[in-house]
């Protein structure tokens, strides 16, 4: 499942790349190993903000795809309470390209510990 | 396109109970959460609480906490709202809304977009 | 808790810019995001603005989004007769952890 994420975030990023979306987004550049479900979550809300804005619907059903698929990997560690993890909001914020490259790292962390 | 078609209008007695479909289409509905809001008549808009349809979470707002109950069923991608001890004041047209929030974490840099039709709930003896 | 202020009431004539303020107390909206939501007469609100200034796809550029301080702010430009709603500011209370709406606008565009 985590291999099909990352399969979708290159598809978000070639799609993106003909289009103007200047958002920033609050991004985890450096994800400690106890901190990543947390981490995930606050990626998956801010990849929302990509469909939101982009009005696309290439962008919006992978986007939508890829929720799934995470979400579906993480329910089995979903509900574990990390503890003095960053709040969404206290992150970096970084332009999108900067986003999906540390999305796709974090995914990483999951495939690699999986 | 993404879409909430809410049930019909309702007239309750005070002290009764009353629930409020929230059918959605258009996206996948276990993947994201449901907020529900309120209207009274000529007044400003109420957040309830939310849901997350994917793992069944809730946030309920401090003045509904004991008389509200909100639910999902992922087979046919329909969220419930449940009021109970209706009083007069509980006159209102009651919104759902998607919120791309699925775990709570998520809640406070969401929003609401699209909205559901509204449904009119009348409480009078 | 917590409050946020609208003015009840708002207008303009046709292609002229109006703004409609939402002001909270000092301690929440300096740290926490304004939302804007749009209630054409007898329809459900419409996310208009986000995250203070962002406008979600579809949504004109006449429209915009600032905050400063404890007080937000929704423009308009070029207002159309196809304005005339009311408009509700809204906030998240991480205390609380619930949302919280202003009490809403009205705009009349006077013909």
């Known amino acids: 499942n985590w291999v099909n994420v990352i399969s979708d975030l290159k598809k978000i990023e070639d799609l993106i790349q003909s289009m103007h979306i200047d958002a920033t987004l609050y991004t985890e550049s450096d994800v400690h190993p106890s901190c990543k479900v947390t981490a995930m979550k606050c990626f998956l809300l801010e990849l929302q903000v990509i469909s939101l804005e982009s009005g696309d619907a290439s962008i919006h059903d992978t986007v939508e795809n890829l929720i799934i698929l995470a979400n579906n990997s993480l329910s089995s560690n979903g509900n574990v309470t990390e503890s003095g993890c960053k709040e969404c909001e206290e992150l970096e914020e970084k332009n999108i390209k900067e986003f999906l490259q540390s999305f796709v790292h974090i995914v990483q962390m999951f495939i690699n510990t999986s | 396109q993404v879409q909430l078609v809410q049930s019909g209008a309702e007239v309750k007695k005070p002290g009764a109970s009353v629930k409020v479909s929230c059918k959605a289409s258009g996206y996948s509905f276990s993947s994201f959460g449901i907020s529900w809001v309120r209207q009274a008549p000529g007044q400003g808009l109420e957040w309830l609480g939310w849901i997350s349809a994917f793992n069944g979470y809730t946030k309920y707002a401090q003045k509904f906490q004991d008389r509200v109950t909100m639910t999902t069923d992922t087979s046919t991608s329909t969220a419930y709202m449940e009021l109970r001890s209706l009083r007069s004041d509980d006159t209102a047209v009651y919104y759902c809304?998607?919120?791309?929030?699925?775990?709570?974490?998520?809640?406070?840099?969401?929003?609401?977009?699209?909205w559901g039709q509204g449904t009119m709930v009348t409480v009078s003896s | 808790q917590s409050v946020l202020t609208q003015p009840p009431s708002a207008s303009g004539t046709p292609g002229q810019r109006v703004t409609i303020s939402c002001s909270g107390s000092t301690s929440n909206l300096k740290r926490n995001y304004v939302y804007w939501y749009q209630q054409l007469p007898g329809t459900a609100p419409k996310l208009l603005i986000y995250r203070d200034r962002r406008r979600p796809s579809g949504v004109p550029d006449r429209f915009s989004g600032s905050k400063s301080g404890t007080s937000a702010s929704l423009a308009i430009s070029g207002l159309r007769s196809e304005d005339e709603a009311d408009y509700y500011c809204a906030w998240y209370d991480r205390e609380l952890s619930e949302w919280v709406f202003g009490g809403g606008t009205k705009l009349t565009v006077l013909q």
């Open positions: 809304a998607r919120d791309p929030a699925a775990w709570p974490l998520q809640q406070s840099l969401a929003w609401f977009d699209p």
